[in-house]
Each structure stands twice: as structure tokens, then as C-alpha cells.
């Protein structure tokens, strides 16, 4: 019996087609992805093959103005239109709190939404009962398939799930659900979830009875053969894990941003054992036409976005200096504003010992592309912010050793004075440079804001200590020459859309007046 699994993950509100790098589509003939194009390919496969499941491994929420405006209603609407068979909850599904998940998505989705390792307690337990499930058994052709969901247990540090949801260990939570399905004669089981490729592989290895793992969170690109675009494969598709009980378990993920549609064919024997598995992600490029009815619907929903872009988010009473002349040479107040917004967006009081789990921000000055003049009545709009942060990136959470951070700050000024983008703007950090010293030895003082303290204060950076830092995904991926970050990071979790972070902060503050205050000094 053959099953075709079509899968997406980490779509991050790319409802419209995008450019090859998943930013805003500029030249339509070269654009990719989007739900209208995805629908065309899905329908083509559904017509051609008998047993097809369309699955999403989480993080539909967050990433473009679509989410900022529609807050998840767009996810439910278009996933319903594409007739997804199931979705796992990702960490970003909690970005607007539990209510922001329940109302727009859980109550409106016409497909099961899954997670076996999230347990509700207190008053939330009855409110959320039945709105998401640990598993769902689906009839597919003449067989039944069990789909068991899971979500990163780090979600309380990455999003806003509140205090009434407990995120259990994935493997511990999955095993009893799989065991139950097995006793009920469900012998084909897919683990669908959002904990990253390393955990996906562990689930394949450790959870007895799981036949296939369809994952997300780490934006992993797997491919067999010559890859069709710029993404470099982390391994073959499917990635085969040998389980502790000796089975070959295929593990898949489909990069991110709706650029690819994962396509996996699995052959099962009559006892539900996987005999063979093969496939590849399908690049959703312009050779695949956009479905006209879905496209028309997208255009209808788009109207509200254009109106939103010009509405006032808040006011500034000072000039927001985002000029290259400032931000690539010295501390600039636009850099301070953005870093303060990044930290504010990551306030998560999850432990009595810590005032917050993260206090530091770094931001490449070259990523700040425009100032905002206060003389336009002080008004700040989404459109203004899109000029400052035009690349559609995310502000991510990483864990780095102090020694890596020191290298990053040395890199920040290794060729100072040439208006290059690697000069770092900061938050929760005090750095002093001596440019008279040779490159690689110019950081003379580097103090960082404590987190395990009731009164935050600046302490010298410790080389062997592990620190959490918020930074643009561009830096996490080694951009602007920050190879040491990419090579030495200990953990990387994708965060919220950059503009969304700053716009939310400005809306919250209402009036802003960021200053240059001595975060970066030269001796």
C-alpha cells in the first residue's frame, strides 16, 4: 500500500508568492511559492495519486504583514481552502498568546491541529478542550493512518503560551499515544511536529511504532540529487534514521516559507511496516501556475494590507537616525530603538531566579536602511519601518559562548571606517573599542547585562559562559562576515518578523524618544 505525504513547514505567513530568497516578490516571472501556486501542485498530485495526505508541521504564524493584520485568520482561511489534512502546532502559533491561537485558528480550522506534548491546566483546560488533539486517525484510501503531533518544549522561551500550558518532553509524551494507536490496530503512524531536525531524528530513533517523521522548526532542507535552487541540503531526502528497535525510519522537512512542497512516497506492507520511501521537495517556481481562484481570493484579502501600511503605529518626538553615516560608524539611536524592541519582544519571566531569559541584542548596522524624520508630525507607519528594515528578516534567539561574542565584536570593527555593514548596534551590552590597536584586538571592554539577578547590572563578559542573544537571522546565518556566529552557535531558534517586532514595540510605547547613551564607546 502506497501513501503520498505532501508537507510544508515554517511557512511564516508567505501567503503571496515571494522572490527566491523568500522576501517580497519583485519580478513576478521569477517568483516562487505562495498558496495559489501550492494549491495548483497539490491538486495536480491529488488527481494523479490515490492516497495523499497534505500536512503542515507548524509555524504558519508570523513573518509578514499578512500575520500582523489578520492575526491567524488568514492561516485558517487559506489552509481550509487548500484542504490540509492536519497541522502540528509550532512555537510561533503562540505569538499572540493562547487566545490568539484559539479564536482565529483552532476554532476556524477545518482540519485537525495536533500536539501530544502540550497539556492544558487550570481554567484553560476546559476552554481549550478538543480544540487541538494529541493525534488524529485519518481514513486514507482503504487504510487508516495515525498522525501524532508534537511541539518544541522550548516554546515558553520562544513565544507567549502563558502559564496554563505545560510543554512536556516530546519523546515521553509521544510514546503512550503511539502505543495506544497500536493497540487500536492503527499500524501506520506519522509523527508530525515542530521541534527541529535533531529532535525529529531522536523521535525516529526512540519512539517505538513511529513509521515516518515529518518535521519543522529548523528550516532544514533535505534533497537527493542536484538541488534546484540556492538552498544547500543538510542531507538526503528522506533522511533515514535507524530506530533503536532496528527499523529504517524516514525523516523529512521542507525548508521553509512555502518555497518547496515536500513530496514523500512511502510503501507499507500489510502489517504497516515501511518497505520503501523516496521523494524530494518540489520547488514551487514560476513554471507552476498560480491557481486563479485562490489568487483572486488572495487579491481580495490583500486590500486590507495596503490600508494598514499607511496607518499610524505610534509617534517619535526625536529624529530616528538610521543613516549609514551614523549606524555604520557609531552608536545610533535607531539601532538602540530596534535592539530595545528586540529585547522587549523576548520578555519571558519563566524562572524566579532570572528577571528575563535574555538581555542582549546585537544588530548589524548595515541592516538599518533608512532614518525616520520626526518632523512629519512624529508619525511612524508600517511603511516607514519597511524602509528601515526592508529585507523581511527575523529577530532570532541564539545561544553563544562569550568567546564567540568577543570574536563578533572584534569583527564589528576589524575594518572600521569604510562604511561597512558589520558594525554592530547593541542592547544590554556596553562595548569599548580602541581603534589604535590592530584588527582582532580592538575590544578593550565588553560588559553584558546580567539575567540571573533581581537588579540588572553590567558585568564583564566571561569567555566560557553560554549567553542568550537576540540578533537578526542574517547574522545567525553568518551574514556580513560573521562566520564565527554561524559556526559556533550552540542553539538557534527562529524569531518574529523584524518589522513586526519594532512596530509592536512602538504601538506599545505610543511615543518614543530613543537616545544615544554610551552603549558603544571609543577609547
Amino acid at each position: 500500500w502506497e501513501l503520498t505525504i505532501l508537507h510544508t513547514n515554517d511557512v511564516h505567513s508567505r501567503l503571496e508568492q515571494t522572490s527566491e530568497d523568500s522576501s517580497k516578490c519583485v519580478n513576478a516571472s521569477r517568483c516562487m511559492g505562495g498558496v495559489a501556486r501550492l494549491f495548483t501542485k497539490v491538486q495536480q498530485i491529488r488527481r494523479a495519486e490515490p492516497n495523499v495526505l497534505l500536512l503542515d508541521a507548524g509555524d504558519q504564524y508570523q513573518g509578514t504583514i499578512w500575520f500582523t493584520v489578520y492575526k491567524g485568520a488568514e492561516v485558517a482561511h487559506f489552509m481550509n481552502a487548500l484542504r490540509y489534512d492536519a497541522m502540528a502546532l509550532g512555537n510561533h502559533e503562540f505569538d499572540n498568546g493562547v487566545e490568539g491561537l484559539i479564536e482565529p485558528l483552532l476554532k476556524e480550522a477545518k482540519f485537525p491541529i495536533l500536539s501530544a506534548n502540550i497539556k492544558a491546566k487550570g481554567p484553560l483546560a476546559s476552554q481549550i478542550s478538543g480544540l487541538y488533539l494529541p493525534y488524529k486517525v485519518l481514513p486514507v484510501g482503504d487504510e487508516v493512518v495515525g498522525i501524532v503531533g508534537y511541539t518544541s518544549k522550548e516554546t515558553p522561551f520562544l513565544s507567549n503560551p502563558g502559564t496554563n500550558l505545560v510543554f512536556e518532553d516530546e519523546i515521553t509524551a509521544l510514546q503512550p499515544e503511539v502505543d495506544k494507536l497500536k493497540t487500536l490496530n492503527v499500524n501506520k503512524i506519522i509523527a508530525l511536529g515542530h521541534s527541529g531536525f535533531e529532535m525529529d531524528k531522536l523521535i525516529a530513533q526512540k519512539v517505538r511504532g513511529v513509521d515516518v517523521v515529518v518535521g519543522g522548526h529548523s528550516n532544514t532542507f533535505l534533497y537527493t540529487g542536484n538541488p534546484p535552487s540556492k538552498e544547500v541540503p543538510a542531507g538526503k531526502y528522506p533522511f533515514i534514521v535507524t530506530s533503536d528497535d532496528g527499523r529504517k525510519v524516514p525523516v523529512v522537512q521542507a525548508y521553509a516559507f512555502g518555497k518547496y512542497l515536500g513530496y514523500l512516497k512511502i510503501e507499507f506492507d500489510e502489517r504497516g511496516n515501511v518497505i520503501s520511501s523516496h521523494g524530494n521537495p518540489i520547488l514551487l517556481n514560476s513554471s507552476i501556475p498560480e491557481d486563479p481562484s485562490i489568487k483572486a481570493d488572495i487579491n481580495k484579502w490583500r486590500i486590507k494590507l495596503d490600508n494598514y501600511s499607511t496607518q499610524e503605529l505610534g509617534k517619535t518626538i526625536v529624529y530616528l537616525d538610521g543613516s549609514s553615516q551614523s549606524c555604520r560608524f557609531r552608536e545610533c539611536n535607531m539601532g538602540n530603538l530596534i535592539c530595545d524592541a528586540m529585547i522587549n519582544n523576548n520578555l519571558r519571566h519563566t524562572d524566579e531566579m532570572f528577571w528575563n531569559h535574555v538581555s542582549m541584542c546585537i544588530l548589524n548596522g548595515g541592516g538599518i536602511r533608512s532614518p525616520i524624520d520626526e518632523r512629519n508630525n512624529g508619525t511612524i507607519t508600517w511603511e516607514n519601518l519597511a524602509a528601515v528594515l526592508p529585507f523581511g528578516g527575523t529577530f532570532d534567539l541564539v545561544q553563544l559562548k562569550g568567546s564567540t561574542l568577543k570574536k563578533a565584536f572584534e569583527h564589528s570593527v576589524h575594518r572600521y571606517g569604510q562604511s561597512t555593514g558589520e558594525f554592530l548596534q547593541v542592547g544590554g551590552i556596553h562595548v569599548v573599542y580602541d581603534l589604535s590597536r590592530k584588527p582582532g584586538d580592538r575590544v578593550v571592554k565588553l560588559d553584558v547585562l546580567c539575567t540571573k539577578c533581581r537588579v540588572p547590572s553590567y558585568d564583564p563578559l566571561k569567555m566560557d559562559e553560554v549567553y542568550k542573544v537576540i540578533l537578526p537571522n542574517f547574522l545567525a546565518n553568518g551574514g556580513d562576515g560573521f562566520q564565527m556566529i554561524k559556526d559556533e552557535l550552540l542553539r538557534h531558534d527562529s524569531g518574529d518578523q523584524d518589522i513586526n517586532v519594532v512596530s509592536t514595540y512602538i504601538s506599545k510605547m505610543k511615543v518614543i524618544y530613543p537616545a544615544v547613551e554610551g552603549r558603544i564607546k571609543f577609547s
Epitope: 477545518k110 478542550s129 493525534y135 485519518l138 481514513p139 484510501g141 482503504d142 495506544k180
Partner: antibody
Framework: QVQMKQSGPELVKPGASVKIPCKAS????????MDWVKQSHGESLEWIGD????????IYNQKFKGKVTLTIDKSSSTAYMELRSLTSEDTAVYYC???????????WGQGTSVTVSS | DIQMTQSPSSMYASLGERVTITCKAS??????LSWFQQKPGKSPKTLIY???RLIDGVPSRFSGSGSGQDYSLTISSLEYEDMGIYYC?????????FGGGTKLELK
């Protein structure tokens, strides 16, 4: 509005077969699976099976395997249930019921009474 | 197969009264539970699915609750047209299984 229209009562002889139609209207036929349910006189309900109108895929209650065949005709938006080798035990009302996105039955046909008697 | 035990098997109630019918599954059914109402000589009518979601057009006096193995259907204020037999169904796994029914009659 969503409707499932079934045929009138059937009186059939033991050992014979009967094929009951269920014509769907008011929605896209291929969007929803169709379940079939048996109700013997004065008794509770028994789930017979489920059919996917897209590909004809079927899931049967083990108890009815060999007794029942579920089929569909997409062109007429009609689901069929064939009962064969009929005995008095098969005398009952048979219902078709559409299932929603959650695979829960939502709209029911009016039922077809099958009486097996010589 | 999962067994569904409904209680009571029959009951009498007055108009305006609050009525609760329960259904217990032989194991956790993951909120995959429906409630149906059947009147004599008629086909069943679906009231609720996924334990607590009301089908369009069903009066709001009907509500469902429960999780795990235990579920209930409540009619907040009984009306004459609510008389009939009520059935629960688990659709968590195959085969789907129904409860034995609860006959609701006027006191």
C-alpha cells in the same frame, strides 16, 4: 441546503442482494466522506463503514466485511451500499450520513428500510 | 473496539428542566465524540461533534462537554420538541461505536 436522499423500502428474499442509493446534493460531493449506519428495530445504531468519494477508498467495520460493499458514482453524486447473501439478521433501516472535515457525521439520509423475508 | 456506555438508558423530565445525559468510553477518545437526537420513525439528527461543537442550526440550549473518557450532553431548558432518543458516538478510531441510547420522555 445539504441533503442525502435515499430510496424507498425494500422487501427482499433471503440469499438475495440489494443495492441502496444515497444521492447527495447541496455541497461538493467529493469534499466529504460518506458513512453508512445500520439500525435494527428498537435497537441502537451500528457503524458499517466509510467511503471516500474522491478515490472510492473504503474502511469497513470488521463485522460487516463480506456482507457489505460501498461504492460511489461521482457523475451522479450518489453513494451506494450493496448488501448480499441477505438473512433475517439484515432486516433493518440503513442510513447514509455525510461526514464533515473532522470525519464526524453531520447530515443524514432519511433511511432505507430493508426487510428480508421469504 | 471501544465501548460506549450511555446513562441513563431512559429518563423523565419536565419542560424547562435542565437535563444531562452522560456517555463513558472504555478508554480516552480524545474529544472525538458526537451526540445525535432521534425521533420515532425519523433519521438521527447531529447535534454536536468534537465533544462540544454545535452543528449549525442546532438550538443553543444544547451543549456538550467532557474530555478523556467522560462526556455529557446538556439541555439547559427542556422543550417539548426535545423528546426522543439521544445517542453518543466515538469517532476517535475505527470502527466508530455508538452508545446504547438514552430515551428522554416528558414527566
Amino acid at each position: 441546503q445539504v441533503q442525502m436522499k435515499q430510496s424507498g423500502p425494500e422487501l427482499v428474499k433471503p440469499g438475495a442482494s440489494v443495492k441502496i442509493p444515497c444521492k447527495a446534493s447541496g455541497y461538493t460531493f467529493t469534499d466529504c466522506n460518506m458513512d453508512w449506519v445500520k439500525q435494527s428495530h428498537g435497537e441502537s445504531l451500528e457503524w458499517i463503514g466509510d467511503i471516500n468519494p474522491n478515490n472510492g477508498g473504503t474502511i469497513y467495520n470488521q463485522k460487516f466485511k463480506g456482507k457489505v460493499t460501498l461504492t460511489i458514482d461521482k457523475s451522479s453524486s450518489t453513494a451506494y451500499m450493496e448488501l448480499r447473501s441477505l438473512t433475517s439478521e439484515d432486516t433493518a433501516v440503513y442510513y447514509c450520513a455525510r461526514t464533515n472535515w473532522d470525519y464526524a457525521m453531520d447530515y443524514w439520509g432519511q433511511g432505507t428500510s430493508v426487510t428480508v423475508s421469504s | 473496539d471501544i465501548q460506549m456506555t450511555q446513562s441513563p438508558s431512559s429518563m423523565y423530565a419536565s419542560l424547562g428542566e435542565r437535563v444531562t445525559i452522560t456517555c463513558k468510553a472504555s478508554q480516552d477518545i480524545n474529544s472525538q465524540l458526537s451526540w445525535f437526537q432521534q425521533k420515532p420513525g425519523k433519521s438521527p439528527k447531529t447535534l454536536i461533534y468534537r465533544a462540544n461543537r454545535l452543528i449549525d442550526g442546532v438550538p443553543s440550549r444544547f451543549s456538550g462537554s467532557g474530555s478523556g473518557q467522560d462526556y455529557s450532553l446538556t439541555i439547559s431548558s427542556l422543550e417539548y420538541e426535545d423528546m426522543g432518543i439521544y445517542y453518543c458516538l466515538q469517532y476517535d478510531v475505527f470502527p466508530r461505536t455508538f452508545g446504547g441510547g438514552t430515551k428522554l420522555e416528558l414527566k
